[in-house]
């Protein structure tokens, strides 16, 4: 079988507020009924986990309570919300997806999202 | 279905050589990453050595350099880890992995791999 192919956009730009969001869509090439989704960040050949959730399918994706991302899911579709960014936080974002249950086992891995975080301007000080 | 499997671990005595095969199948794509993991009871899943499939770039654990070359013929969908100056420290089971990347991704990151074979497990003992 070839990778199972996971698509994304390729540019995103976050809000002033640093948050920035993105679909993540995936050939799945079965009836997966459970689902792991991962957002990595690579960044100067370095990669990090951002966040990751499983889900079964039909169901809410959970994250951890820390975690930056929230997410919702529509058939093989996942919406990808992350916030708390900031400038520094510019990157390559990956998603992975691993169709975990039933067997067998499929991974495929986006080509990643480039997102852009701008740290919005202070207010100058007000007469007022 | 992708299947990876190990061959070639054993019981070898310090400063011998082993060299592991790990067979892939199921798997289409001219692009992807693989390579060799080791993990023992009391420690992580580590990369040992890897090497993408297109262009041939490797990389190793600092633990092995200069003593372990990985290789491939993809004619066999085949890869090699040849082990040489084996020390007690790499006894472990060792697992082949894949990863289905593109040209985009870092080359031979753990976070890519998904895909595992069955191990095989190397002892170094006198």
């Known amino acids: 079988c070839k990778a199972m192919h996971v698509a994304q956009p390729a540019v995103v730009l976050a809000s002033s507020r640093g948050i920035a969001s993105f679909v993540c869509e995936y050939a799945s090439p079965g009836k997966a009924t459970e689902v792991r989704v991962t957002v990595l960040r690579q960044a100067d050949s370095q990669v990090t986990e951002v966040c990751a959730a499983t889900y079964m399918m039909g169901n809410e994706l959970t994250f951890l309570d820390d975690s930056i991302c929230t997410g919702t899911s529509s058939g093989n579709q996942v919406n990808l919300t992350i916030q708390g960014l900031r400038a520094m936080d510019t990157g390559l974002y990956i998603c992975k997806v691993e169709l975990m249950y039933p067997p067998p086992y499929y991974l495929g891995i986006g080509n990643g999202t480039q997102i852009y975080v701008i740290d919005p301007e202070p207010c100058p000080d007000s007469d007022f | 279905e992708v299947q990876l499997v190990e061959s070639g671990g054993g019981l070898v005595q310090p400063g011998g050589s082993l060299r592991l095969s790990c067979a892939a199948s199921?798997?289409?794509?001219?692009?992807?990453?693989i390579g060799w993991f080791r993990q023992d009871p009391e420690k992580e899943r580590e990369m040992v050595s890897c090497?993408?499939?297109?262009?041939?770039?490797?990389k190793y654990a600092d633990s092995v350099k200069g003593r372990f070359t990985i290789s491939r013929d993809n004619s066999k969908n085949t890869v090699y880890l040849q082990m040489n100056s084996l020390e007690a420290e790499d006894t472990a089971v060792y697992y082949c992995?894949?990863?289905?990347?593109?040209?985009?991704?870092?080359?031979?990151?753990?976070?890519?791999?998904?895909?595992w074979g069955q191990g095989t497990r190397v002892t170094v003992s006198s």
């Open positions: 992995g894949l990863a289905p990347i593109s040209p985009v991704h870092a080359v031979c990151n753990q976070h890519y791999f998904g895909y």
């Open positions: 199921g798997f289409s794509s001219d692009y992807y990453d």
């Open positions: 090497i993408r499939s297109s262009g041939g770039s490797t």
